[in-house]
């Protein structure tokens, strides 16, 4: 795991501690909170980023209708348990022994229970719908220009191959970005859609995770695209298991 060689920092994760103690005196970076080594050429997993965040000091195209099984992250921040690869453990518990099951993006997918709760496997989130509303502009953006710009952004900034950007829908002022990725589709080095969506979400909120890079400056044919609202829906390969009580 190496980082930028000249100044020992991690370009893709500012929530790291870096030092030239890798093999041959090379720069090595470790995530805050977990102390896990991270690969600074790619995105850090959302689990490690959430853990680092909790440890840091506090400061005519029709739009897609999310399915009834779509999850929204209403629980907010928590200090997650990550596996040795930096992925979310299927079962998460808080300090008061309240436990719940999460999907691969760390969003709760069951009712909360006690320590006896079993989460047999980490269920993969294979479809993410990013719903954006942009600020008023002189005219609507050209849809194909918007599509191309967002694909370029996800490849260059988040390293997500365009094959995983399934569609970009646009009905002014709403933009929807659909990310799709089955477990079998991921090849060596491919970024996870959950990690890309999290970096994008933080960029949109003006909380960039990148080191020393400017904030997100999104332009479509020179026209700034300023987002005023974001909603992210997560669809899992297996539907979530909530009791009827939650739905009323």
């Amino acid at each position: 795991h190496t980082a930028a060689q000249d100044n020992c920092t991690c370009p893709t994760n500012k929530m790291t501690v870096c030092s030239p103690d890798g093999p041959g005196g090379r720069c090595q970076c470790r995530a805050l909170g977990s102390g896990m080594a991270v690969d600074c050429s790619t995105l850090t997993s959302k689990c490690l980023l959430l853990k680092a965040r909790m440890s840091a000091p506090k400061n005519a195209r029709t739009l897609v209708r999310p399915s009834e099984h779509a999850l929204v992250d209403n629980d907010g921040l928590y200090d997650p348990d990550c596996d040795p690869e930096g992925r979310f453990k299927a079962r998460q518990c808080n300090q008061t022994s309240v436990c719940w099951c999460v999907n691969s993006v760390g969003v709760r997918r069951t009712d909360k229970g006690d320590l006896s709760l079993r989460c047999d496997e980490l269920v993969r989130t294979h479809h993410i719908l990013i719903d954006l509303r942009h600020r008023p502009t002189a005219g609507a953006f050209n849809h194909s220009d918007l599509d191309a710009e967002l694909r370029r952004l996800f490849r260059e900034r988040y390293r997500l191959h365009p094959k995983f950007v399934a569609a970009v829908h646009y009905e002014q002022p709403t933009i929807q970005i659909e990310l799709r990725q089955n477990t079998s589709q991921k090849a060596a080095g491919d970024v996870d859609i959950g990690d890309a969506a999290y970096y994008f979400e933080r960029d949109i909120k003006g909380e960039s995770l990148f080191q020393g890079r400017g904030g997100l400056d999104l332009r479509v044919r020179g026209e700034p695209l300023q987002v005023e609202r974001t909603l992210i829906y997560y669809l899992d390969e297996i539907p979530p298991k909530f009791s009827m009580k939650r739905l009323t």
Epitope: T2, A4, S41, R155, E156, H161, K186, A187, A188
Partner: antibody
Framework: QVQLVQSGAEVKKPGASVKVSCKAS????????MHWVRQAPGQGLEWMGE????????SYAQKFKGRVTITRDTSTSTAYMELSSLRSEDTAVYYC????????????WGQGTLVTVSS | DIQMTQSPSSLSASVGDRVTITCRAS??????LNWYQQKPGKAPKLLIY???RLQSGVPSRFSGSGSGTDFTLTISSLQPEDFATYFC??????????FGQGTKLEIK
């Protein structure tokens, strides 16, 4: 060890098609991108296209769109590159190469297949 | 498409020399720059990926540096087997992934 073994040299007439094969071994075929790169005699390297064997996704360089088709057979761990409407300037050595999704570096290459287009 | 320009296009050097080859991208490519070595009649061989990471099995006399648009491949002490053609390649943006035109390293 990782190996990519390509089919033998081909001589084709202008307007014909050629299909080059690339058999992978020593790794899980569906876990890596496969790319095709060509090199005209005495010239540089030119990227043609890519495929993910797991789901048959392909993308091609604009220059070759409509003429090139990359396919795969997961049962034999083999990738194929077919180039149609051949012309003399397609005379080149064609390489398959295993790729990494993030760096887009090509860490293992086939030995190359010389395709000669001549009337 | 991103253009990659190598310099020089050819150079002569002696065994033991320190040699530097440069590669310039037509736009910022961060650190997504790879270097290959090719010998006559053979397939290219990956030397360095992500600007400075040495591919497994490649001798430590090869090193890479740079960021953004300007990159360098350095061979600290030339060995007889290093005389070959070297190519840079970017993997930053959407396809196509582009190569430099090559630098031929010859024996002086």
């Amino acid at each position: 060890q990782v190996q990519l073994v390509q089919s033998g040299a081909e001589v084709k007439k202008p307007g014909a098609s050629v299909k080059v094969s690339c058999k992978a071994s020593g790794y899980t075929f569906t876990s890596y991108w496969m790319h095709w790169v060509r090199q005209a005699p005495g010239q540089g390297l030119e990227w043609m296209g890519e495929i993910t064997p797991s789901d048959n996704y392909t993308s091609y360089a604009q220059k070759f769109k409509g003429r090139v088709t990359i396919t795969r057979d997961t049962s034999t761990s083999t990738a194929y590159m077919e180039l149609s409407s051949l012309r003399s300037e397609d005379t080149a050595v064609y390489y398959c190469a295993r790729g990494h999704g993030n760096y887009v570096s090509f860490d293992y290459w086939g030995q190359g297949t010389l395709v000669t287009v001549s009337s | 498409d991103i253009q990659m320009t190598q310099s020089p296009s050819s150079l002569s050097a002696s065994v033991g020399d320190r040699v530097t080859i440069t590669c310039r991208a037509s736009q910022d490519i961060s650190n997504y720059l790879n270097w290959y070595q090719q010998k006559p009649g053979k397939a290219p061989k990956l030397l360095i990926y992500y600007t400075s990471r040495l591919q497994s099995g490649v001798p430590s006399r090869f090193s890479g540096s740079g960021s953004g648009t300007d990159f360098t491949l350095t061979i600290s002490s030339l060995q007889p087997e290093d005389f070959a053609t070297y190519f840079c390649q970017q993997g930053y943006t959407l396809p196509p992934y582009t190569f430099g035109q090559g630098t031929k390293l010859e024996i002086k």
